[in-house]
């Protein structure tokens, strides 16, 4: 809005800081127990995974940057149970990537979470 | 802890994701004028900046991703104060950089937050 | 300083399309949302939907899904709206509108007619 | 969609005189966020809408200190402290909270 009064090189600079903070698919760090909504006596080795999520801003307040299509990527874990009855367990657990985003006006009616196969 | 009944190529890609996961500074958007604390009648052009924050799982569900080291990067964005009473300003604001984290037990006394010059 | 310049008036007949353009200057184009808006002769603002600049992605009121197209050409800062199987009651001033991060439409085109006769 | 009644329809006022158009919406205009996103516009003869007051209560660039806005929730007032000729017009309440963004039917301001 103000490209008489500053140097094209600093409205520049200034644009492609805006342009990387745009709601789009990032890579993010998920516990699985909570999304998996296990219950308190099992446990993820690793109890983290990376995938991507849609996160940054949107050219309105009002507006939430939401997922709009998704895949599942499957993660080899160890499921532990306590008290360890058994050899720790690796088991494939499916977790939401989010492969598309937009912003919205209101959170969804499903959002996406983890699928256990 | 189960390398005798699994083979070294799965447990190797489980360790490598668990080190992505790990505790450390990750890129992050973060939106200005709610860092900054501003009244409702500033605005900031780009609304968000991206810097480092601590962010990824501890080893420990009792412990949290903190900073331990910080460093400010000096952000140009515009200030807009509504109503408009002069062109948009632009202004250095300074933006926390988490340059080191660790898994600490409790919350720190002095969250690092955005200064203005 | 922020401007929006609109095409020209059109006369149309029912059944055919309009293309609608609005010029923008004095800003970033991709950092703010194009809103369009439309008002029958003496009667009140209908929100017909807006397009994000940065990606194009458009959301439309639901009353004219189907039969509203919104684009842009960032290489120059223009949003287009097309509305297609034009009806006598599409007779109306278009306006396209800017709208800031805090959600008012802050700067406004100077509309454009639309007339739908056979 | 979020119906949005203003009241009157129609203001004759007097040269210096106070005026005072309500806006009521069919569901709280609270944001998940906490904003409330409710403007006020105004059309004079022949002009496209201009924007007075965004969000409840803030005067856009331009505007007059006689033009207030005030409410929460469901209700909300434009105020004119003084009315002045040039404020002659047709005033429209709008809300960004939900979509899709709908409009009052407009408040015609003339002089007595």
């Known amino acids: 809005f103000a490209a008489t009064f500053y140097d094209i090189e600093t409205l520049k600079v200034i644009d492609e800081e805006w342009q990387r903070t745009q709601c789009s698919p990032r890579e993010t760090c998920v516990e699985v127990a909570s999304e998996l909504g296990k219950s308190t006596n099992t446990f993820f080795k690793p109890p983290c995974v990376n995938v991507f999520r849609c996160g940054g801003c949107c050219n309105e307040e009002s507006l939430i940057c939401m997922n709009t299509s998704t895949s599942y990527i499957s993660k080899q874990l160890f499921e532990i149970s306590v008290p360890l009855t058994s050899v720790p367990e690796l088991v494939p657990v499916k977790v939401a990537n989010h492969t598309g985003c937009k912003c919205l006006p209101t959170a969804p009616r499903h959002p996406y979470s983890i699928i256990r196969r | 802890f189960a390398a005798t009944f699994y083979d070294i190529e799965t447990l190797k890609v489980i360790d490598e994701e668990w080190q992505r996961t790990q505790c450390s500074p990750r890129e992050t958007c973060v939106e200005v004028a709610s860092e900054l604390g501003k009244s409702t009648n500033t605005f900031f052009k780009p609304p968000c900046v991206n810097v480092f924050r601590c962010g990824g799982c501890c080893n420990e569900e009792s412990l949290i991703c903190m900073n331990t080291s910080t460093s400010y990067i000096s952000k140009q964005l515009f200030e807009i104060s509504v109503p408009l009473t002069s062109v948009p300003e632009l202004v250095p604001v300074k933006v926390a950089n988490h340059t080191g984290c660790k898994c600490l037990p409790t919350a720190p006394r002095h969250p690092y937050s955005i200064i203005r010059r | 300083q922020v401007q929006l310049v609109q095409s020209g008036a059109e006369v149309k007949q029912p059944g055919a399309s309009v293309k609608v353009s609005c010029k923008a200057s004095?800003?970033?184009?991709?950092?703010?949302?194009m809103y369009w808006v439309r008002q029958a002769p003496g009667q009140g603002l209908e929100w017909m939907g807006y397009?994000?600049?940065?990606?194009?992605?458009?959301t439309y009121n639901q009353k004219f899904k189907g039969r509203v197209t919104m684009t842009t050409d960032t290489s120059t800062s223009t949003a287009y709206m097309e509305l297609r199987s034009l009806r006598s009651d599409d007779t109306a001033v278009y306006y396209c509108?800017?709208?800031?991060?805090?959600?008012?439409?802050?700067?406004w085109g100077r509309g454009t007619l639309v007339t739908v006769a056979s | 969609d979020i119906v949005m009644t203003q009241t009157p329809l129609s203001s004759p006022v007097t040269l210096g005189q106070p005026a005072s158009i309500s806006c009521r919406s069919s569901?709280?205009?609270?944001?998940?966020?906490?904003?409330?996103?409710l403007h006020w516009l105004q059309q004079r003869p022949g002009q496209p809408p201009r924007l007075l007051i965004y969000?409840?209560?803030n005067r856009f660039s331009g505007v007059p200190g006689r033009f207030s806005g005030s409410g929460a929730g469901t209700d909300f007032t434009l105020k004119i402290s003084r009315v002045e000729a040039e404020d002659v017009g047709v005033y429209y309440c709008?809300?960004?909270?939900?979509?899709?963004?709908?409009f009052g039917q407009g408040t015609k301001l003339e002089i007595k």
């Open positions: 509108a800017r709208t800031s991060y805090y959600g008012g439409m802050d700067y």
């Open positions: 709008s809300q960004s909270t939900h979509v899709p963004r709908t």
């Open positions: 004095g800003y970033t184009f991709t950092g703010y949302n």
């Open positions: 569901q709280s205009l609270v944001h998940s966020n906490g904003n409330t996103y």
């Open positions: 969000k409840v209560s």
């Open positions: 397009i994000d600049p940065y990606n194009g992605d458009t």
